[in-house]
């Protein structure tokens, strides 16, 4: 019995087609992805093949103005239109709190939304009961397939799930649910979830009875053969894991941002054993036409976004200096504002011993592309912020050793004076440079804000200690020559859209007046 699994993950609000790098579409003839194009390909496969499931492995939320404005209603609407069969909860589905998940998505979705390792307690338990499920048995042709969901247990550190949701260990939570499916005579089981490729592989290895793992969170690109675009494969598609009980379990993921549609064909025998598995992600490029009816719907929804872009988010009573003459040479108040917003967006009081789980921010000065003049009545709009942060990136959470941070700050000024983008703006860090010294030895003082303290204060950086840092995804991926970050990071979780982080902060503060205050000397 052959099953076709179509899958997406980490779409992050890319409802419209995008450029090849998943930023805003400029030249339509070379754009990719988007739900209208996705629908064309899905329908084509549904017409050609008998047993098809369309699955999403989480993180539909967060990433463009679509989410900022529609807050998840757009996800429910267009996923319903595409007739998704199931979705797993990702960490970003909790970005607007539990209410921001329940009302727009859980109550509106016409498909099951799954996670076996999230347990509700207290008053929330009855409110959310039945709105998401640990598993769902789906009829597919003459057969049935069990889908069991999972979500990163790091979600409380990455998003805003509140205090009434407990995130359990994935493997511990999945095994009893899979066992339950087996007692219901369901012998074809897909684990669909959002914990990253390493956990996906562990689930394939450790959870008895899971036949296929469809994952997300790590934006992993897998491909067999010559890849069709710029993404470099982390392994073959599907990636085969040998389980502890001796079965070959295919593990798949489909990069991110709706650029690809994962396409996996599985042949099962009567016992539910995977006899064969093969496929590849399908690049959703311009050779695939956008479905006209979905495209028309997108255009209808688009109108509200254009109006939103020019509305006031808040006010500044000072000049927001985002000029390259400042931000690539010294501490600039636009850099301070952005870093403050980045830390504020990551406030998570999950432990009494810590005032927060992260206190530090670094930001490449070259990523700040425009100032904002306060003389326009102080008004700040989304449009203004889009000029400051035009690249559509995210502000991510990483874990780095102190020694890596020291290297990063040396790199920040290794060719100081040439107006290069690697000069770092900071938050929760005091750095002192001596530019008379030779490159690689210019950082003379590096103090960082404590987290395990009730009164935050600055302490000298310890080389062997592991620190959490918020930074742009551009830096996490080694951009501007920060190869040491990419090579030495111990953990990397993708965060919220850069503009959204700053706009939310400005809306929250209402009036802002960031200063240059001696963070960089």
């Amino acid at each position: 019995w052959e099953l076709t699994i179509l899958h997406t993950n980490d779409v992050h609000s890319r409802l419209e087609q995008t450029s090849e790098d998943s930023s805003k579409c400029v030249n339509a003839s070379r754009c990719m992805g988007g739900v209208a194009r996705l629908f064309t390909k899905v329908q084509q496969i549904r017409r050609a093949e008998p047993n098809v499931l369309l699955l999403d492995a989480g993180d539909q939320y967060q990433g463009t103005i679509w989410f900022t404005v529609y807050k998840g209603a757009e996800v429910a609407h267009f996923m319903n239109a595409l007739r998704y069969d199931a979705m797993a909860l990702g960490n970003h589905e909790f970005d607007n709190g539990v209410e921001g998940l329940i009302e727009p998505l859980l109550k509106e979705a016409k498909f099951p939304i799954l996670s076996a390792n999230i347990k509700a307690k207290g008053p929330l338990a009855s409110q959310i009961s039945g709105l998401y499920l640990p598993y769902k048995v789906l009829p597919v042709g003459d057969e049935v397939v069990g889908i069991v969901g999972y979500t990163s247990k790091e979600t409380p550190f990455l998003s805003n799930p509140g205090t009434n949701l407990v995130f359990e260990d994935e493997i511990t939570a999945l095994q009893p649910e899979v066992d339950k499916l087996k007692t219901l005579n369901v012998n074809k089981i897909i684990a669909l979830g959002h914990s990253g490729f390493e956990m996906d592989k562990l689930i394939a290895q450790k959870v008895r009875g899971v036949d296929v793992v469809v994952g997300g969170h790590s934006n992993t690109f897998l491909y067999t053969g010559n890849p069709p675009s710029k993404e470099v494969p982390a392994g073959k598609y599907p990636f085969i894991v040998t389980s502890d009980d001796g079965r070959k379990v295919p593990v798949v993921q489909a990069y991110a941002f709706g650029k690809y549609l994962g396409y996996l064909k599985i042949e099962f025998d009567e016992r539910g054993n995977v006899i064969s598995s093969h496929g590849n992600p399908i690049l959703l490029n311009s050779s695939i036409p956008e479905d006209p009816s979905i495209k028309a719907d997108i255009n209808k929804w688009r109108i509200k976004l254009d109006n939103y872009s020019t509305q006031e988010l808040g006010k500044t009573i000072v000049y927001l200096d985002g000029s390259s003459q400042s931000c690539r040479f010294r501490e600039c108040n636009m850099g301070n504002l952005i870093c403050d917003a980045m830390i504020n967006n990551n406030l998570r009081h999950t432990d009494e011993m810590f005032w927060n789980h992260v206190s530090m921010c670094i930001l490449n000065g070259g990523g700040i592309r425009s100032p904002i003049d306060e003389r326009n009545n102080g008004t700040i709009t989304w449009e203004n912020l889009a000029a400051v942060l035009p690249f559509g990136g995210t502000f991510d959470l990483v874990q780095l050793k102190g020694s890596t941070l020291k290297k990063a700050f040396e790199h920040s000024v290794h060719r100081y004076g040439q107006s290069t983008g690697e000069f770092l703006q900071v938050g929760g860090i005091h750095v002192v440079y001596d530019l008379s010294r030779k490159p690689g030895d210019r950082v003379v003082k590096l103090d960082v804000l404590c987290t395990k303290c009730r009164v935050p204060s600055y302490d000298p950086l310890k080389m062997d200690e592991v620190y959490k840092v918020i930074l742009p995804n551009f830096l996490a991926n080694g951009g501007d020559g920060f190869q040491m970050i990419k090579d030495e990071l111990l953990r990397h979780d993708s965060g919220d859209q850069d503009i959204n982080v700053v706009s939310t902060y400005i809306s929250k503060m209402k009036v802002i007046y960031p200063a240059v205050e001696g963070r960089i000397k």
Epitope: E270, N273, S276
Partner: antibody
Framework: EVQLVQSGAEVKKPGASVKVSCKAS????????MNWVRQAPGQGLEWMGR????????FYSQKFKGRVTMTVDKSTSTVYMELSSLRSEDTAVYYC???????WGQGTTVTVSS | DIQMTQSPSSLSASVGDRVTITCRAS??????LNWLQQKPGGALKRLIY???SLDSGVPSRFSGSGSGSDYTLTISSLQPEDFATYYC?????????FGGGTKVEIK
């Protein structure tokens, strides 16, 4: 649990036909196919062909084409294998086996003797 | 048709021995290979499917490996109940074909 139950032993004369049945249970019958395999006394296994339960599509080994007919009765989840123009070298145990031979019938002994 | 050449055709071994049986296909068969066990009474049982996946209930002393046209069944520590005849089966293309079998006997 998958179970395949075959019909009883048969003794046939050369030139006659034999029809062996295989009743399946414990799985969604229409979603799969059935193989027929035979084993002559003291010999190895020989694949004869297969039938898809849902629509009765068949694929026969070239060696048996024209002599073998596989049919299905979806209402009783039963598959049949008929072999005609029997000769002495068709004396064998005939097995039905699921799609990828994960489960086997108990075997049906067919003796061709004058 | 794809020919499956299985070797050895028989072998004598003692309890606890490591036993290796090989099958060579006349062309590349991908991973489309099963290993079957037939006890003296005639009952057939699949041990390994898709080259290396172990059927449920089959002891972990059985393992399969290989790719292209060369495949191996290994019994890491032979047990009394393992004395039987073993067959490989390719299902990469029609007609499916079996190896000639390997009879594992007590030394």
């Amino acid at each position: 649990e998958v179970q395949l139950v075959q019909s009883g032993a048969e003794v046939k004369k050369p030139g006659a036909s034999v029809k062996v049945s295989c009743k399946a249970s414990g799985y969604t019958f229409t979603a799969y196919f059935m193989n027929w395999v035979r084993q002559a006394p003291g010999q190895g296994l020989e694949w004869m062909g297969r039938i898809y339960h849902n629509n009765g599509d068949t694929f026969y080994s070239q060696k048996f084409k024209g002599r073998v007919t596989m049919t299905v009765d979806k209402s009783t989840s039963t598959v049949y294998m008929e072999l005609s123009s029997l000769r002495s070298e068709d004396t064998a145990v005939y097995y039905c086996a699921t799609s990828y031979v994960g489960d086997w019938g108990q075997g049906t002994t067919v003796t061709v003797s004058s | 048709d794809i020919q499956m050449t299985q070797s050895p055709s028989s072998l004598s071994a003692s309890v606890g021995d490591r036993v290796t049986i090989t099958c060579r296909a006349s062309q590349d068969i991908g991973d489309s290979l099963n290993w079957l066990q037939q006890k003296p009474g005639g009952a057939l049982k699949r041990l390994i499917y898709a080259t290396s996946s172990l059927d449920s209930g089959v002891p972990s002393r059985f393992s399969g490996s290989g790719s292209g046209s060369d495949y191996t069944l290994t019994i890491s520590s032979l047990q009394p109940e393992d004395f039987a005849t073993y067959y490989c089966l390719q299902y990469a293309s029609f007609p499916w074909t079996f190896g000639g079998g390997t009879k594992v006997e007590i030394k």
